[in-house]
Interface confidence: medium
């Protein structure tokens, strides 16, 4: 218990801490500029991303991951992600050439809090939003996805890239820049303005006026290529992928000594290369160029192919599976991949979260709860089952008139009416003689408790069903001595048999009362009786806690990924979607203990472990 004074002190401390503790601000920002998105060159290029006559617009998503670290599947965009604004609306013009599509304004910016890793993986998705009048608002679909791994120093110039995804082509530029006070190629060094009373670290000279201290001293080795080199310490020159040499000016796999052309160098004895097909490195995406007798050849890094390594082939190395998906590559490391998606996600990259509640799975007014890893229905009072499909008390609040008894079953109540009444609620008077119940010409008389038959000569019984034979023999069993045949009023049973019949009738009456309380079950195995222990949340986690009935043992499909199978058990009256199992709270005590049979993990509950004929007692 915290006193008011103590709580005031606590809140003051929190406020002070918030003021004086350093605020978490990004170390830097990765910026992505999309230049164009449209059909790529070559045959089979799509005319338009929009469906015929339906306007659409584009937007982009970028996902960044540290390139060299093995990222956990749960954090697919460990460096961050960003979504662009929606682009202008585009409508396909019939017959017009396929254009580059109108793009969203501005940059995609991904702030990063920690050090910029230098090597990173990116995934850029192009999404289409269709603006037709479809039910449920606009429809989104993924048009293209490109991915790659790059080296990039923070603070460097914009790097340009072209990527192809299927028949689409995406042109873009990107850079990483530090946010003050962070500086350096990894944005790990902090600087204060010159006015602040501090000095830079060892080996750093004071800054020029109006410049930030520590900013100026980081100068790479003189002549270090600004396009292909970078430095993290003053005076060094480190090369981006695909480049080598002391100043990062030599493409990998090309050496001046290998070229047969050009004059010899006096200092090295090597041939000084003249202009050749590999000059300027025509190989994109870090590919290395080597000359061939006729032209050049690119050796592409993993995940790229094409004459100039310009085509991106996304592989598992690019981490393309979102939302904890497991990436399974093809037999060849460079071949296509398949994302195995966890429950609740689908799509080729597990990028689509299924709004399973929109399918309205909960019946009878149940509330649908999508908990991510599980889909649950919270049932209204009186309903149970994974989708609230079982009516626990069909008769609640419904009365049967004129002494009728309510019988539940199948989600709707039914009245078993007293003799002389009929209709849904036993409100209609019924003529018990209308059905001509008296056999062999017997006359029927209606009566407050039912009917009476006056039998024609030669017949007897409640419905005149037994003939009385002229020779004195009866259709009934032989009467004990001293009794006249055809005298049912005085036809006595032996005491033991009489007791047995009485017990049977009493038992049947009890059973009928129970049936009327609990309801007829069409399938004895499709209903759980009370007395079944409620599953404990500690017993078996997830779907194994669901009590399964005979009907649910392997008939019906396994759940689709949209209906995710692995679920939690909630003992607070929430019913777990795990069709066709039933997990219900019970309301009545059974007459007989349930019989537990069947395979492990299943319970079959037999409603009446007695012959069913006992239920036909009139």
């Amino acid at each position: 218990m915290v006193s008011p004074r103590m709580s005031g002190l606590l809140s003051q401390t929190v406020i002070l801490a918030l003021i004086f503790l350093p605020q978490t601000r990004p170390a830097g920002v990765f910026e992505l500029q999309i230049h164009s998105f449209g059909p790529g060159p070559g045959p089979g290029a799509p005319r338009s991303p929009c469906s015929a006559r339906l306007p659409c617009r584009l937007f982009f998503r970028v996902c960044l991951k540290p390139g060299l670290s093995e990222e956990a599947a749960e954090s697919p965009c460990a460096l961050g992600a960003a979504l662009s604004a929606r682009g202008p609306v585009y409508t396909e013009q019939p017959g017009a050439p396929a254009p580059d599509l109108p793009l969203p304004d501005g940059l995609l910016q991904v702030p990063f809090r920690d050090a910029w890793p230098g090597t990173f993986s990116f995934i850029i998705e192009t999404w289409r939003e269709e603006l037709g009048d479809q039910i449920g608002g606009p429809a989104w679909s993924l048009l293209a996805r490109v991915a790659g791994r790059r080296r990039l120093a923070a603070g460097g110039p914009w790097a340009r890239d072209i990527q192809r995804a299927g028949a689409w082509e995406l042109r873009f530029s990107y850079r990483a820049r530090c946010e003050p006070p962070a500086v350096g190629t990894a944005c790990t060094r902090l600087c204060r303005p010159r006015s602040a009373p501090s000095r830079c670290g060892p080996g750093l000279r004071p800054c020029a006026p109006l410049e930030d201290e520590c900013e100026a001293p980081l100068v790479c080795r003189a002549g270090c290529s600004p396009e292909h080199g970078f430095c993290e310490q003053p005076g060094e020159c480190r090369c981006l992928e695909g480049w080598t040499g002391p100043l990062c000016t030599v493409p990998v796999s090309t050496s001046s000594c290998l070229s047969p052309r050009g004059p010899s160098s006096a200092t090295t004895g090597c041939l000084v290369p003249g202009p050749g097909p590999c000059d300027g490195n025509p190989c994109a995406n870090g590919g290395s160029c080597s000359e061939t007798p006729r032209s050049f050849e690119c050796t592409c890094p993993r995940g790229f192919y094409g004459l100039r390594c310009e085509v991106s082939g996304v592989t598992c190395a690019d981490g393309p599976c979102f939302n904890g998906g497991l990436c399974v590559g093809g037999a060849d490391p460079d071949s296509a991949y398949i994302c195995h998606c966890p429950p609740g996600f689908q799509g080729s990259n597990c990028e689509k979260r299924v709004d399973r509640c929109s399918l309205q799975p909960c019946r009878n007014g149940g509330l649908c709860l999508d908990l991510g890893h599980a889909l649950r229905c919270r049932c209204r009072a009186g309903f149970a089952g994974p989708r609230c499909e079982h009516d626990l008390d069909d008769c609640a609040g419904r009365a049967c008139a004129n002494g009728g008894t309510c019988v539940e079953g199948g989600g709707a109540h039914r009245c078993s009416c007293a003799l002389g009444f009929g209709g849904r609620d036993c409100r209609e008077r019924a003529d018990p003689c209308a059905a001509r119940p008296c056999a062999h010409g017997g006359r029927c008389y209606a009566h407050f408790s039912g009917l009476v038959c006056a039998c024609a000569p030669g017949y007897m019984g409640a419905r005149c069903e037994f003939p009385v034979h002229p020779d004195g023999a009866s259709a009934l069993p032989a009467a004990p001595p001293g009794l006249r045949p055809g005298d049912p009023q005085r036809y006595l049973l032996p005491p033991a048999l009489g007791l047995l019949v009485a017990a049977g009738v009493a038992g049947a009456a009890l059973l009928l009362v129970h049936v009327r309380r609990r309801g007829h079950s069409q399938d004895a195995g499709s209903r759980l009786l009370a007395g079944t222990p409620e599953p404990s949340v500690h017993a078996l986690p997830d779907a194994l806690n669901n009590l399964r009935t005979q009907e649910g043992s392997g008939d019906g499909p396994s759940s689709s990924v949209d209906w995710n199978r692995p679920e939690d058990v909630d003992p607070q009256g929430i019913y777990v979607i795990s069709a066709p199992s039933i997990y219900a709270r019970e309301v009545a005590t059974p007459l007989f203990p349930p019989l537990h049979t069947g395979r492990a993990g299943q319970r079959q509950h037999l409603l009446f472990p007695y012959p069913s004929s006992i239920l036909s007692v009139k």
């Epitope: 399974v328 590559g329 093809g330 037999a331 689908q346 499909p557 689709s560 990924v561």
Partner: nanobody, 119 residues
């Protein structure tokens, strides 16, 4: 539709081994991916292992060295051999089956088999 039945779960001591089996039946296709998903109480679920139609395997970091996934296409089955089991491997293991039709992946899940690692 596809039905999946897992077996092989049970109680095992830390450091012990267990092999889970899963059989797919129903309208299965040869172009499918299979694997295992596990959920422990109060933990986020994960996919420890998967195998593609051509037999390529993938493992989560937590399962890389200790678990081996294999499949028998003739029997429409997938297996998970788990060695050096630890307490944190205790979970319900669900077999899954994906097949792609017209670019859409359909996923199916079994009922699960409980693996308890405890001394």
């Amino acid at each position: 539709e596809v039905q999946l039945v897992e077996s092989g779960g049970g109680l095992v001591q830390p450091g012990g081994s267990l092999t889970l089996s899963c059989v797919a039946s129903g309208s299965t296709s040869s172009i499918n991916a299979m694997g295992w998903y596990r959920r422990a109480p109060f933990k986020q679920g994960e996919l420890p292992a998967g195998i593609s139609p051509d037999g390529t395997k993938a493992y989560a970091d937590s399962a890389k060295v200790r678990f081996t996934i294999s499949r028998d296409n003739a029997k429409n089955s997938v297996y998970l051999q788990m060695n050096s089991l630890r307490a944190e491997d205790t979970a319900v293991y669900y077999c899954y089956y994906f097949h792609t039709v017209c670019g859409t992946s359909m996923g199916y899940w079994g009922q699960g088999t409980l693996v308890t690692v405890s001394s």
